[in-house]
Interface confidence: low
């Protein structure tokens, strides 16, 4: 079956720069389809724009401006690529790639579609580093005792743009945990998210990965926040001695780290 | 030009109560066409629901049902038993990939119907209520009430900001909520929450601790192993300190 | 093998009952819509009816609308159809036909006899 | 519902082309491109030809091409063989959510 990855959750320009959107095939030759390119501005339909073929023709929608957008593929890497020459405002949109998959059955086709990339245009100039800052929250004892149950919780703070993936796996799995999240909010110029997991007792004792995709991130790839294992009957820790404390003491540990 | 017009631009559902998503096609006999449900959720992603006739997309045949009423020229989406994973941006789009003479393999999108998830009407639940801190930042944590109406108040007096609670639908049908803050005295924080006109407040087995008690250990390069930031020799920490060790990463 | 087979055919009276049965073999069922196609001895064929794969949608010619009842079992791969009130003019080959995609039929089986006599 | 219409029998020689029609109304053959063509022989099930028009299914001859204008429906048959001799029926969906066939039309292959 085929699969689509657009790894740009976003892309950010200013006005009258170019931005080019990639678009990953699998399980499909990129050679032997058809790839589609269709864009969603804010409160308007899905449109088509443009599509290249399996021999490489070209196919625009009527209406859409020549030489706006150009549509490429890379047999080698398997991708295709739609470029948004000299961005203005009216291409604020996210764009989606897409192929008809033909299903097992005689004349069944469907069209899937890629997650999409948002396209961003400011003329702000932001700080530095707008990759999204982790805190952790491990379960409060409260909930481990009365509901046999812990809740982890993810906060990522100051980050531009606002488009933001999150999700929750176990170390050493690749199932997505059914997670739940809050509101991106503004703050300031940049944004925060939460994202909570609740897991059963039984998997308190795994070390759980929170999981976030953004355009900032560092070297462009996700950013997995580790959450250390509980143990609901004792916890062994392994610091240095001037972490330590007497184990009848209260032991609050922050860990902090300003290279994330 | 050919249009596609969704019955409701949004369409309140209740957990396990059938509903119908209807489309009609302005300008065309929609049995010229082949119609297709797409579901948008949050984080934009497009997945495949259903297509003339009897096509459905990985998951969604237990659950929905697509049909065609030619007489009205409208296509019908007819969500089973809707669940939380339910809510959602659809579209119908329709194309006329296959068929004879000028057929087009591109879809023709109308604009979308916001389906809102709202758990089915059920007895009212009191919410369970905890607290989570790490530094100078407290969450919290409002599990399986009902109903949604629900005040969080973090009690403190050197609030920094505070944040607007999210209020989302639990897997058990009910509602989880959490209010995130930040505060000086973070150790002194609770959390009270107002619900069917009885206050709740935070369960707390932790014992209370001072700022003094912190220990920042160096910095470390590695975001995938913070629990090896402070080198090797052990300490041992009792169920009830659980929720003391806190990371920022 | 991708195969239909009906069964069930045989002489009735007017006035009386039979239900037909098809099965389905070699393929995914529970994926394809399926219908009844009868032809008379020397005539054409005559479409009678459809069922969706879940059962929702359901058509009827207007020649059997009211006596005759499509139904099927995704479980049992078999597709049914309630023959009731039958007539003189119900006399035909019935052949059960899967759907490719919409409104043409890409697999028919080899049809049962129903011969309406008194 | 009437059935579509089409010549009771149409002839030709081996190597020839013939071309059976299909007429029907706005409500059926001229209102959807859900037209099929069907081959059966004597004693036999039928065997799709054409579908959606002019699709023809895999394994089914490139000789056999369909198309559509107005409320009429052809199916053109060249390089005519011996084997192509048999009842040819055309169906069309119908606006009122059934389908029709037509009367059938017999292939003498001279």
């Known amino acids: 079956a085929g699969h689509l990855e657009q790894p740009q959750i976003s892309s950010t320009k200013t006005l009258s720069k170019t931005a080019r959107l990639e678009c990953v095939v699998s399980g499909i030759t990129i050679s032997a389809t058809s790839v589609y390119w269709y864009r969603e501005r804010p409160g308007e339909v899905i449109q088509f724009l443009v599509s290249i073929s399996y021999d490489g023709t070209v196919r625009k929608e009527s209406g859409i401006p020549s030489g706006k957008f150009e549509v490429d593929r890379i047999p080698e890497t398997s991708t295709s690529t739609l470029t948004i020459h000299n961005v203005e405002k009216q291409d604020i949109a996210t764009y989606y790639c897409a192929l008809w998959e033909a299903q097992q059955e005689l004349g069944k086709k469907i069209k899937v579609f890629g997650p999409g990339t948002k396209l961003i245009i400011t003329d702000k100039q932001l700080d530095a580093d707008v990759s999204p800052k982790p805190t952790i929250f491990l379960p409060s004892i409260a909930e481990t005792k009365l509901q046999k149950a812990g809740t982890y919780l993810c906060l990522l703070e100051k980050f531009f743009p606002d488009v933001i993936k999150i999700h929750w796996q176990e170390k050493k799995s690749n199932t997505i945990l059914g997670s739940q999240e809050g509101n991106t909010m503004k703050t300031n110029d940049t944004y925060m998210k939460f994202s909570w997991l609740t897991v059963p007792e039984k998997s308190l004792d795994k070390e759980h990965r929170c999981i976030v995709r953004h355009e900032n991130n560092k070297n462009g790839v996700d950013q997995e926040i580790i959450f250390p294992p509980i143990k609901t009957d004792v916890i062994t820790m392994d610091p240095k001695d001037n972490c330590s404390k007497d184990a009848n003491d209260t032991l609050l540990l922050q860990l902090t780290n300003t290279s994330a | 030009a050919i249009e596609l017009v969704p019955e409701h631009q949004t369409v309140p559902v209740s957990i396990g109560v059938p509903a119908t998503l209807r489309c009609s096609m302005k300008g065309e006999a929609i049995g010229n066409y082949y119609i297709n449900w797409y579901r948008k959720t949050q984080g934009n992603t497009m997945t495949f629901i259903y297509r003339e006739k009897d096509i459905y997309g990985p998951g969604f045949k237990d659950n929905f049902q697509g049909d065609i009423d030619i007489a009205k020229n409208l296509a019908v989406l007819k969500i089973l038993a809707p669940s939380e994973r339910d809510e959602g941006s659809y579209y119908c789009a329709c194309d006329t990939l296959g068929m004879g003479g000028e057929y087009t393999d591109k879809l023709i999108f109308g604009k979308g119907t916001r389906v809102t998830v709202e758990p089915r009407s059920q007895p009212h639940t009191k919410p369970s209520v905890f607290v989570m801190k790490n530094g100078t930042n407290v969450a919290c944590l409002v599990k399986e009430f009902y109903p949604k109406d629900i005040r969080i108040n973090l009690v403190s007096s050197k609030k920094i900001t505070e944040f607007d609670p999210a209020i989302v639908i639990s897997p058990s049908g009910k509602y989880n909520a959490v209010k995130l803050g930040k505060y000086e005295d973070s150790n002194s924080v609770t959390c009270s929450v107002q619900h069917d006109n009885k206050t709740v407040h935070s369960t707390d087995f932790e014992v209370k601790t001072d700022s003094t008690d912190h220990v920042k250990p160096k910095e470390t390069e590695n975001t995938k192993q913070p629990s090896k930031s402070c080198h090797k020799p052990k300490a041992i920490v009792h169920t009830e300190k659980v929720n003391m060790m806190s990371l920022t990463v | 093998e991708v195969q239909l087979v009906e069964s069930g055919g045989g002489l009735v009276q007017p006035g009386g009952s039979l239900r037909l049965s098809c099965a389905a073999s070699?393929?995914?069922?529970?994926?394809?819509?399926m219908n009844w196609v009868r032809q008379a001895p020397g005539k054409g064929l005559e479409w009678i009816s459809y069922?969706?794969?879940?059962?929702?949608?359901?058509y009827y010619s207007d020649s059997v609308k009211g006596r005759f009842t499509v139904s099927r079992d995704n479980a049992k791969n078999s597709l049914y159809l309630q023959m009731n009130s039958l007539r003189d003019e119900d006399t035909a080959v019935y052949y059960c036909a899967r759907e490719g995609d919409w409104w043409y039929f890409d697999l028919w089986g080899r049809g049962t006899t129903v011969t309406v006599s008194s | 519902q009437s059935a579509l219409t089409q010549p009771a029998s149409v002839s030709g020689s081996p190597g020839q082309s013939i071309t059976i029609s299909c007429t029907g109304t706005s409500s059926d053959v001229g209102g959807y491109n859900y037209v099929s063509w069907y081959q059966q022989h004597p004693g036999k099930a039928p065997k799709l030809m054409i579908y959606?028009?002019?699709n023809r299914p895999s394994g089914v001859s490139y000789r056999f091409s369909g198309s559509k204008s107005g409320n009429t429906a052809s199916l053109t048959i060249s390089g005519l063989q011996a084997e192509d001799e048999a009842d040819y029926y055309c169906?069309?969906?119908?606006?009122?959510?059934?389908?029709?066939f037509g009367g059938g039309t017999k292939l003498t292959v001279l």
């Open positions: 070699g393929f995914t069922f529970s994926t394809y819509g």
């Open positions: 069922i969706s794969t879940s059962s929702y949608t359901i």
């Open positions: 169906s069309s969906y119908t606006s009122s959510s059934t389908l029709v």
């Open positions: 959606e028009v002019s």
